[in-house]
């Protein structure tokens, strides 16, 4: 007969208030004949948690039927866990004795500690938008977890980031902890549709991490590029001039036409289209009345994007019967 071993596989068991805790204990031998009891703590002051033979333990149930002759599983469940239940639990084998049973061997013990799940991570981006090629900071916070050990990772579009700093507070003992992490992200022009993800893994989450997300669309500003062109065909005494505003984000945009420095109040036709990368294109058409007698006309397309300084593009129209495209230049 092999020597009796008392196996308590979990060194630490994290439980949540109100839930049921399962304390595992198996034996490798049925001998010597005698009961297995559960205690919290050691020494003369230890507290009896479960005795199959006698006593009233309303919150304790056994995982297996202990009356079965060949039972080797003495695991128990404790329901409605409270903070008062924390401590180290031992399954202890007794051999039959008289007048009392004699303690024979103890398991190594399982420490029961209260675990608290972290709150859902909240990711905050920068207060103001930034243009591509610049670095922006995102913060991630999660609170109320215990024990202190926690893992936090950052991802951008599924790719793990490495440029971040994380702090867990407080540094000393506490009933609950908080984590704060700041990640530095370099913006790319195509990041309108990108996401940053903060992932928090904790023992209480049983391998199912919590995630917080932020959309880079809230942090990025992609400035437009402008192009003004004159349509080659003339319709009567009107020429169609197009201002193409390309690849901008966000959508907020004001466009005005000027003719020889004078802002034109009349409406122009326009279309807004969205690109696959989430940026926008805006096309505006302006009809210019011309006559053979007029001086040359200089048209300016001015764009104010997302409250930034206006940018403009000029086009000089050559009013001749044989129109041809003129060179254009940009002014800030």
């Amino acid at each position: 007969e092999e020597e009796l071993q008392m196996i308590q596989p979990e060194k630490l068991l994290l439980v949540t208030v109100g839930k049921t805790a399962t304390l595992h204990c198996t034996v490798t031998s049925l001998l010597p004949v005698g009961p297995v009891l559960w205690f919290r703590g050691v020494g003369p002051g230890r507290e009896l948690i479960y005795n199959q033979k006698e006593g009233h333990f309303p919150r304790v149930t056994t995982v297996s039927d202990l009356t079965k002759r060949n039972n080797m599983d003495f695991s128990i469940r404790i329901s409605s866990i409270t903070p008062a239940d924390v401590g180290t639990y031992y399954c202890v084998k007794f051999r039959k004795g008289s007048p009392e049973n004699v303690e024979f061997k103890s398991g190594p013990g399982t420490e029961m500690a209260l675990g608290a799940k972290p709150s859902a991570p909240v990711v905050l981006g920068p207060a103001a938008r930034t243009t591509p090629e610049h670095t922006v900071s995102f913060t991630c916070e999660s609170h109320g977890f215990s024990p202190r050990d926690i893992t936090l990772k950052w991802f951008k579009n599924g790719n793990e980031l490495s440029d971040f700093q994380t702090n867990v507070d407080p540094t000393g003992q506490s009933v609950a902890y908080s984590i704060r992490s700041t990640a530095r992200v370099v913006l790319d022009p195509w990041d309108v549709r990108s996401q940053v993800i903060c992932e928090v893994a904790h023992v209480t989450l049983q391998g199912d991490p919590l995630r917080g997300t932020a959309n880079l669309s809230e942090a990025i500003r992609v400035p437009p590029t402008l192009e003004v062109t004159q349509q080659p065909m003339r319709v009567g005494n009107q020429v169609n001039v197009t201002c193409q505003v390309r690849k901008f984000y966000p959508q907020s945009l004001q466009l005005t036409w000027s003719e020889n420095g004078n802002v034109c109040q009349r409406e122009t036709a326009s279309t807004l289209t969205e690109n696959k990368d989430g940026t926008y294109n805006w096309t505006s058409w302006f009809l210019v009345n011309i006559s053979d007698q007029r001086d040359d006309v200089v048209l300016t397309c001015q764009v104010k994007h997302d409250g930034q300084l206006a940018v403009s593009k000029r086009l000089a129209l050559e009013v001749t019967v044989h129109q041809k495209d003129q060179s254009s230049d940009a002014t800030p």
Epitope: E1, P32, P35, N51, K53, E54, T67, S98
Partner: antibody, heavy 120, light 107 residues
Framework: QVQLVQSGAEVKKPGASVKVSCKAS????????ISWVRQAPGQGLEWMGW????????NYAQKLQGRVTMTTDTSTSTAYMELRSLRSDDTAVYYC?????????????WGRGTLVTVSS | DIQMTQSPSSVSASVGDRVTITCRAS??????LAWYQQKPGKAPKLLIY???NLQSGVPSRFSGSGSGTDFTLTISSLQPEDFATYYC?????????FGGGTKVEIK
């Protein structure tokens, strides 16, 4: 195989002593307790006492206290029951039985019994 | 001491009959009760332990129930080899005590 083999029948005079042996085989002797149970002719079962084959602790029935001694010899896997100052009402079949319950007491293996006759 | 009272002391029955034997403890013994079968000139044989657990090798026509003070042994369909004397035994505490026995006889 797993068994308990008891010593043979005895005839004793009143006032004498008897020592019955019970040899275990086929199992780990030290892992179990042994109880002794007797049965007078035509009567029911009467528990006499228990001994731990591991530690040697004993518990005897009140009415036999002082007259009975139970011992074990782990080297030979044998249990012994000695009854002194025999009386005619001690005439009975004496059984040894392996005690197998973990938190309780029951007997899953019995010897065939030893008849002890006390007669003048 | 815990007294064990068995009833009836004897019962006449035929092969195929359902037989029920009861055992009452003088105080609560949880489920620490065993049932034995004894045939003339033989040692007792364990049938049921811990009130309701069938000992290995015992036919399933034997069953036990009860808890606290009242317990029952049932033979669902009596077979010729079942004619014997049956004892209950409390194993809750020393001194261990047996019931007076129930003799199951052929009708």
């Amino acid at each position: 195989q797993v068994q308990l083999v008891q010593s043979g029948a005895e005839v004793k005079k009143p006032g004498a002593s008897v020592k019955v042996s019970c040899k275990a085989s086929g199992y780990t002797f030290g892992g179990y307790g042994i109880s002794w149970v007797r049965q007078a002719p035509g009567q029911g079962l009467e528990w006499m006492g228990w001994i731990s084959a591991y530690g040697g602790e004993t518990n005897y029935a009140q009415k036999l206290q002082g007259r009975v001694t139970m011992t074990t010899d782990t080297s030979t896997s044998t249990a012994y029951m000695e009854l002194r100052s025999l009386r005619s009402d001690d005439t009975a079949v004496y059984y040894c039985a392996r005690e197998a319950g973990s938190s309780w007491y029951d007997f899953d293996l019995w010897g065939r019994g030893t008849l002890v006759t006390v007669s003048s | 001491d815990i007294q064990m009272t068995q009833s009836p002391s004897s019962v006449s029955a035929s092969v195929g009959d359902r037989v029920t034997i009861t055992c009452r403890a003088s105080q609560g013994i949880s489920s620490w009760l065993a049932w034995y079968q004894q045939k003339p000139g033989k040692a007792p044989k364990l049938l049921i332990y811990a009130a309701s657990n069938l000992q290995s090798g015992v036919p399933s026509r034997f069953s036990g129930s009860g808890s606290g003070t009242d317990f029952t042994l049932t033979i669902s369909s009596l077979q010729p080899e079942d004619f014997a004397t049956y004892y209950c035994q409390q194993g809750a505490s020393f001194p261990i005590t047996f019931g007076g026995g129930t003799k199951v006889e052929i009708k």
